[in-house]
């Protein structure tokens, strides 16, 4: 019987060009975590395997960093990074738990752009 629950950062936003940490936490179970997959809609970003450690997909190695913990750091964000992200926990003996995060990448704020210019 699967008793665990996944807590995530939920819906988050970040600025274009910046970075964001995606975090999930599995609780309320004594099951052993054997692997965590991080996926974006239909793309596999990275895995953290209990035996091998982290492996980042070659498609994302320049923009994705492992951690902190079992989380994932996305760097150099673009508006195309907007969308659903999933943390998939493979556990024994429970099976698979899935958490969902929605990330919205925003253009830099008007206030920040304005701060770069001096008014004559």
């Amino acid at each position: 019987m699967m008793t665990g629950t996944i807590e995530t950062t939920g819906n988050i936003s970040a600025e274009k060009g910046g970075s964001i940490i995606l975090q999930c936490h599995l609780s309320s179970t004594t099951a052993q975590v054997t692997q965590v997959n991080w996926e974006q809609q239909d793309q596999l970003l990275a895995i953290c395997n209990a035996d091998l450690g982290w492996h980042i997909s070659p498609s994302f190695k320049d923009r994705v960093a492992p951690g902190p913990g079992l989380g994932l750091t996305l760097q150099s964000l673009t508006v195309n990074d907007t969308g659903e992200y999933f943390c998939i926990y493979h556990t024994y003996p429970d099976g698979t738990y899935t958490g969902r995060i929605f990330l919205e990448v925003l253009e830099s704020s008007v206030a920040e752009h304005g701060a770069r210019f001096q008014i004559p």
Epitope: Q35, L44, I47, H55, S57, P58, F86
Partner: nanobody, 116 residues
Amino acid sequence: EVQLVESGGGLVQAGGSLRLSCAASGRTFGDYIMGWFRQAPGKERELVASVSGGGNSDYADSVKGRFTISADNAKNTVYLQMNSLKPEDTAVYYCAAVFSRGPLTWGQGTQVTVSS
């Protein structure tokens, strides 16, 4: 569940070439990361090369410029072309794969021996 079957290992002289194949069957849908690891006697298993469903690849420094990983998505097969082989490349080579939402799966391994 995904099954992996490797082939192509053998004995080769230093400077020679071998091509390893890894055929995946079973639950092979969605994006993937597939790779080749190797383990020499008394040493830890190390990543040699990996490839993603998007076709991007990554290599260990020790094999860059000598080994090439490629994938045939229609055949669910990944290849490792090994050129300019050295005695230190001698090891058991293992294929590994993760498909979307799935766990890491290992092949049974194939022996590569490079004689000097």
